[in-house]
Interface confidence: low
C-alpha cells in the first residue's frame, strides 16, 4: 500500500529557477498530507514542504533556506524553486505522506530528478568585453 511517485528524470534551471512536478498515484483531494522535496542521494536536505489540509489553506515552507513555492493539483504537487545556485545541482526526490483519513500512507522512493542549475548569463561589461569573434 505505497503511493507511487513520477518525476521528470532531469530538469535544467536556466534562470536559477525551476518547476518540479511530483505526480502521485493517489488523489489528494480532501486529504491531510505532507508533500516534501529532498536534495541529495541520501535525501539529507529537506528543500521544501507543502502541507495540505482540506479545512485550511495550503502551507508552503522551507526550513533549509530555499526559496520555494508550491501548487496543488488533484494528484500532484508542483514545487517552484527560485534563486538556485550552480552548486545546488543535484538529485531531488519527491516524498508524500497522507495522514488523514487513515490509514497513514507514504510513497515508494522515486527515481528522483536531476536538477542542473545553469547560472544567469550576465551581459559582459563594456569595460571588460568578452573574447572577440573571428
Amino acid at each position: 500500500n505505497k503511493i507511487l511517485v513520477k518525476q521528470s528524470p532531469m530538469l535544467v534551471a536556466y534562470d536559477n529557477a525551476v518547476n518540479l512536478s511530483c505526480k502521485y498515484s493517489y488523489n489528494l483531494f480532501s486529504r491531510e498530507f505532507r508533500a516534501s522535496l529532498h536534495k541529495g542521494l541520501d535525501s539529507a536536505v529537506e528543500v521544501c514542504v507543502v502541507y495540505g489540509n482540506y479545512s485550511q489553506q495550503l502551507q508552503v515552507y522551507s526550513k533549509t533556506g530555499f526559496n520555494c513555492d508550491g501548487k496543488l493539483g488533484n494528484e500532484s504537487v508542483t514545487f517552484y524553486l527560485q534563486n538556485l545556485y550552480v552548486n545546488q545541482t543535484d538529485i531531488y526526490f519527491c516524498k508524500i505522506e497522507v495522514m488523514y483519513p487513515p490509514p497513514y500512507l507514504d510513497n515508494e522512493k522515486s527515481n528522483g530528478t536531476i536538477i542542473h542549475v545553469k547560472g544567469k548569463h550576465l551581459c559582459p561589461s563594456p569595460l571588460f568585453p568578452g573574447p572577440s569573434k573571428p
Epitope: 500500500n1 488523489n27 488523514y100 483519513p101 487513515p102 490509514p103 497513514y104 500512507l105
Partner: antibody
Framework: EVQLVESGGGLVKPGGSLRLSCAAS????????MNWVRQAPGKGLEWVSS????????YYSDSVKGRFTISRDNAKNSLYLQMNSLRAEDTAEYYC????????????WGQGTLVTVSS | EIVLTQSPATLSLSPGERATLSCRAS??????LAWYQQNPGQVPRLLIY???NRATGIPVRFSGSGSGTDFTLTISSLEPEDFAVYYC?????????FGQGTKVEIK
C-alpha cells in the same frame, strides 16, 4: 488465489470476551492494510477497525473504541480482533477484508464468523 | 460521520430489465464512493470504486455514475445472479460508512 478465513466466533455472555482470527493466503499479507467489517443479522455493513501493514497505525469505529483491539502477525499471515466488554449490539457476522491498492476499498472479504452476545 | 441513504429499499424487477439504484450522501464525498453486491448467504463483493470504475472481473452491465452527494448504480440488463443486496460505501471522509442497502428482487 487470495483467501481470507475467519475463525473464533461463538456465543458469549454480555461483558464477556472473544478473540477473532483471520488467516490470509495467496498474497503478500505484510504489504496490505487489513480491516474488520461487521454485519448485524438482517442489517447493513459497518466498518469496525483497520490496521496498517506494519501495525504502526490502528483505527476503530466509535462504537468499539476502548473495547476492541486489532492486531496482526505478519510472520503467521494472521489478523486478529480482541473483543472485550461485549454487548448485545455487537452481535454480528464479522468479516476480515483486505484493503487493496486503493485506500479504504475493501476487496476481497473473508467468509465471516458469527459472534452472538446473549445471556 | 457521513450518512449514506440508499433508495429504494427494495426494487422488484424481472430478468432482462434495467435496474437503477441510488445512493445519497449527507455531505460531499467527491467521487470516493464504492458499490458492493451481496448475494444471499454470500460475502460482499466489490463492484465499483471511486464512483465509476469497475473492479476486476465485474461484467460491463454494471456501471456507476455521480459525484458529490448523488450517485447511481445501473445494471443494464438483469441476470439471475444479479438479484441481491447492493451497498454503497464512501471513503471521502473519516470514518468509512456504508448505506443501508437496496434489495433487488425478482418480480
Amino acid at each position: 488465489e487470495v483467501q481470507l478465513v475467519e475463525s473464533g466466533g461463538g456465543l458469549v455472555k454480555p461483558g464477556g470476551s472473544l478473540r477473532l482470527s483471520c488467516a490470509a493466503s495467496g498474497f503478500t499479507f505484510s504489504s496490505y492494510t487489513m480491516n474488520w467489517v461487521r454485519q448485524a443479522p438482517g442489517k447493513g455493513l459497518e466498518w469496525v477497525s483497520s490496521i496498517s501493514s506494519s501495525s504502526s497505525h490502528k483505527y476503530y469505529s466509535d462504537s468499539v473504541k476502548g473495547r476492541f483491539t486489532i492486531s496482526r502477525d505478519n510472520a503467521k499471515n494472521s489478523l486478529y480482533l480482541q473483543m472485550n466488554s461485549l454487548r448485545a449490539e455487537d452481535t454480528a457476522e464479522y468479516y476480515c477484508a483486505r484493503e487493496g491498492d486503493i485506500v479504504l476499498i475493501f476487496d476481497p472479504w473473508g467468509q465471516g464468523t458469527l459472534v452472538t452476545v446473549s445471556s | 460521520e457521513i450518512v449514506l441513504t440508499q433508495s429504494p429499499a427494495t426494487l422488484s424487477l424481472s430478468p432482462g430489465e434495467r435496474a437503477t439504484l441510488s445512493c445519497r450522501a449527507s455531505q460531499s464525498v467527491s467521487s470516493y464512493l464504492a458499490w458492493y453486491q451481496q448475494n444471499p448467504g454470500q460475502v460482499p463483493r466489490l463492484l465499483i470504486y471511486d464512483a465509476s470504475n469497475r473492479a476486476t472481473g465485474i461484467p460491463v452491465r454494471f456501471s456507476g455514475s455521480g459525484s458529490g452527494t448523488d450517485f447511481t448504480l445501473t445494471i443494464s440488463s438483469l441476470e439471475p445472479e444479479d438479484f441481491a443486496v447492493y451497498y454503497c460505501q464512501q471513503r471521502g471522509n473519516w470514518p468509512p460508512t456504508f448505506g443501508q442497502g437496496t434489495k433487488v428482487e425478482i418480480k
